[in-house]
């Protein structure tokens, strides 16, 4: 037997356990942490990836100014509750019964409360702004080449439909990628912008989630594009609800 052929792996998610125990003995992969079956032909949801991560051993000014309602993920890692489809549950709580509401990318959008806190619906993040600063290079990248390369990356590596990459802005050394996807625009089978952004973030950090693929080697006309810092802003369809205390802090 050829060992490599006679086993199961998940090309799009290395944080899985796979075996030929699906229907008809087909390969079936389950996410670590949750044990949920994942579709290896597309990206795994961010919620299941976070759960798996927690279970693992440990020209003119064109740049966009994030809206006052933009959220940044300051809370870092947590062990999320995911619904049967692998999406974040609207309400998340920790082991000490502290609860908060999250958006569709799992970022907190309310003050923390107790078990009585209600989160009526999972609010969709419809606009993601990925703000990158690249390492110094001999000269600036050509904007249209950079635009084309980043769009290609999101289309080919993350399988995100090109219509969801709204814009690529560049003002050396800052690059901004805007992803937009309303609830009405997202068809069945479409990759979610939140999942694509998370895979991209992990790639940029050198922590690729893809099985056996090399790390991300971003090049613009042969010139390496090396990112030295990343900031991601999340805009929800409904503005977040934080107390004034947080806003003035």
């Amino acid at each position: 037997h050829t060992a490599a052929q006679d086993n199961c792996t998940c090309p799009t998610n290395k944080m899985t356990v796979c075996s030929p125990d699906g229907p008809g003995g087909r390969c079936q992969c389950r996410a670590l942490g949750s044990g949920m079956a994942v579709d290896c032909s597309t990206l795994t949801s961010k919620c299941l990836l976070l759960k798996a991560r927690m279970s693992a051993p440990k020209n003119a000014r064109t740049l966009v100014r994030p809206s006052e309602h933009a959220l940044v993920d300051n809370d870092g890692l947590y062990d999320p509750d995911c619904d049967p489809e692998g999406r974040f549950k609207a309400r998340q709580c920790n082991q000490t019964s502290v609860c908060w509401c999250v958006n569709s990318v799992g970022v907190r959008r309310t003050d923390k409360g107790d078990l009585s806190l209600r989160c009526d619906e999972l609010v969709r993040t419809h606009h993601i702004l990925i703000d990158l600063r690249h390492r110094p290079t001999a000269g600036a990248f050509n904007h249209s080449d950079l635009d084309a390369e980043l769009r290609r990356l999101f289309r080919e590596r993350y399988r995100l439909h090109p219509k969801f990459v709204a814009a690529v802005h560049y003002e050396q050394p800052t690059i901004q990628i805007e992803l937009r996807q309303n609830t009405s625009q997202k068809a069945a089978g479409d990759v979610d912008i939140g999942d694509a952004a998370y895979y991209f973030e992990r790639d940029i950090k050198g922590e690729s989630l893809f099985q056996g693929r090399g790390g991300l080697d971003l090049r613009v006309r042969g010139e390496p594009l090396q990112v030295e810092r990343t900031l991601i802003y999340y805009l929800d369809e409904i503005p977040p609800k934080f107390s004034m205390k947080r806003l003035t802090a």
Epitope: Q5, D21, P23, G25, C27
Partner: antibody, heavy 115, light 112 residues
Framework: EVKLVESGGVLVKPGGSLKLSCAAS????????MSWVRQTPEKRLEWVAS???????YYPDSVKGRITISRDFARNILYLQMTSLRSEDTAMYYC?????????WGQGTLVTVSA | DIVMTQSPLTLSVTIGQPASISCKSG???????????FNWLLQRPGQSPKRLIY???MLDSGVPDRFTGSGSGTDFTLKISRVETEDLGVYYC?????????FGSGTKLEIK
């Protein structure tokens, strides 16, 4: 050694119901995907139902709604519940243990649907 | 449904001689997970089917190495280097890439 023994096949009238059993041994039943495959009198093979390790069930459209695959982990038995039987359901029914396909087959149990 | 077309319907072979059976599918059997869920089975007279080959070319345990499976996409072949008496019976191909899973109609291998 993997052993699969089917039983429950009888002569049944059209519209009737039947429950087939498959006693499994020689492997970890709870970790395995299992299926039922039938062979018509013309010797044509047809996939009938599958159950994955996570107990998700799968059926071809031709039997959906009339056939249910299930299992009893305590007794290591795979079942096939058949209702609203038709003459075209007449076949030898085989239970299989699955790994990249139908890896192991039982000896089969004969179901005849006739008035 | 994916149609699996086997040829020939009957194959008459002299013991010790090679034999080859073809199976063509109506659609590529390469799955999105990179695997090709294609099997060859043999049903000897009066017996249950027994799998010989899985994932196109992998031999099941206990299957003699005179059997070889090859192919990709839509075209697959089973070759027997030297036919022996125990190889007689009906050979079926199967696909598990697309739902519903489907079988070929069979190729009967008989002695000339």
């Amino acid at each position: 050694e993997v052993k699969l023994v089917e039983s429950g096949g009888v002569l049944v009238k059209p519209g009737g119901s039947l429950k087939l059993s498959c006693a499994a041994s020689g492997f970890t039943f709870s970790d395995s995907a299992m299926s039922w495959v039938r062979q018509t009198p013309e010797k044509r093979l047809e996939w009938v139902a599958s159950i994955s390790r996570g107990d998700d069930t799968y059926y071809p459209d031709s039997v959906k709604g009339r056939i249910t695959i299930s299992r009893d982990f305590a007794r290591n038995i795979l079942y096939l519940q058949m209702t609203s039987l038709r003459s075209e359901d007449t076949a030898m029914y085989y239970c299989t243990r699955d790994r990249f396909g139908f890896a192991y087959w039982g000896q089969g149990t004969l179901v005849t649907v006739s008035a | 449904d994916i149609v699996m077309t086997q040829s020939p319907l009957t194959l008459s072979v002299t013991i010790g001689q090679p034999a080859s059976i073809s199976c063509k599918s109506g659609q590529s059997l390469l799955d999105s997970d990179g695997k090709t869920y294609f099997n060859w089975l043999l049903q000897r007279p009066g017996q249950s089917p027994k799998r010989l080959i899985y994932l196109v070319s992998m031999l099941d345990s206990g299957v003699p190495d005179r059997f070889t499976g090859s192919g990709s996409g839509t075209d697959f072949t089973l070759k027997i280097s030297r036919v022996e008496t125990e190889d007689l019976g009906v050979y079926y191909c199967w696909q598990g890439t697309h739902f519903p899973f489907t079988f070929g109609s069979g190729t009967k291998l008989e002695i000339k």
